[in-house]
């Protein structure tokens, strides 16, 4: 296989520190030359690379939403890390948004789990001690932890 | 979806030239490599060369340097092979590919290929 280069590789950038790769991979924090020559950093708070690799460039550094709060920022090795605010939680088969949790559990039931930034309140059946699916009741029918305030939705 | 459309491949008689081009669609990463490929009846798929879009770098494999010459058109977002001096052993299907790689020279280092284009050198 031969080389030739058609045009000359931008210089890197002060913050694009680079290094030689190893066994064709360059290091975590860092993307491969088009060549496979050189290991060029990421650029911090901008993008990041986890693993050891030969791509042609860092992945892109996650922004939190509204809604969310920043439990760590991005660094080069490491991507963003973002957490639901306090009343609100992220599901894992709808992990795109934060949604409300809701205040309180059906009639009949009762409140065995909290709301956290990964799960609703868990309510179970009094007697039986079976979970409740998750479905939002009917407000009238709705037993809140504040009396007179119905339940949020999960929207 | 990343597409990739391969054009060009026919039938040439030995010693003559041909262009194939790969125009490539829904391509979004912040650079990436476009190279070319043949399989002839039989044999293992085969690195020809690949060229880079941001810095336009170029490797050729050794079979068909100075014979065949890689290019690109970034507003057309196609690649291009000039294939000349061909031969009966150039005969092939010939696949465009798209990596995100470094010094993508193997196979195993694209992602997305096109359906590929048949040539045939024949007298």
């Known amino acids: 296989i031969t080389q030739q280069d058609l045009a000359p590789q931008q210089r890197a950038a002060p913050q694009q520190k680079r290094s030689s790769p190893s066994e064709g991979l360059c290091p975590p924090g860092h993307h491969i030359s088009e060549d496979g020559r050189d290991c060029i950093s990421c650029k911090y708070g901008q993008d990041y690379s986890t693993h050891w690799n030969d791509l042609l460039f860092c992945l892109r550094c996650t922004r939190c939403d509204s809604g969310e709060v920043e439990l760590s920022p991005c660094t080069t090795t490491r991507n963003t890390v973002c957490q639901c605010e306090e009343g609100t939680f992220r599901e894992e088969d709808s992990p795109e948004m934060c949604r409300k949790c809701r205040t309180g559990c059906p009639r009949g039931m009762v409140k065995v789990g909290d709301c956290t930034p990964w799960s609703d309140i868990e309510c179970v059946h009094k007697e039986s001690g079976t979970k409740h699916s998750g479905e939002v009741p009917a407000v009238e029918e709705t037993v809140t932890s504040s009396p007179g305030t119905p339940a949020s939705p999960c929207s | 979806e990343v597409q990739l459309l391969e054009s060009g491949g026919g039938e040439v008689q030995p010693g003559g030239s041909l262009r194939l081009s790969c125009a490539a669609s829904g391509l979004t990463f912040p650079n990436y490599g476009m190279g070319w490929f043949r399989q002839a009846p039989g044999k293992e798929r085969e690195f020809l060369a690949v060229?880079?879009?941001?810095?336009?770098?170029?490797f050729y494999a050794e079979s068909v340097k100075g014979r065949f010459t890689i290019s690109r058109d970034n507003a057309k977002n196609t690649v291009y092979l000039q294939m000349s001096s061909l031969r009966a052993e150039d005969t092939a299907v010939y696949y465009c590919?798209?990596?995100?790689?470094?010094?993508?020279?193997?196979?195993?280092?694209?992602?997305?290929w096109g359906q590929g284009t048949l040539v045939t050198v024949s007298s």
């Open positions: 590919a798209v990596t995100i790689r470094g010094a993508a020279t193997q196979t195993w280092k694209y992602d997305y």
């Open positions: 060229i880079y879009w941001s810095g336009g770098t170029v």
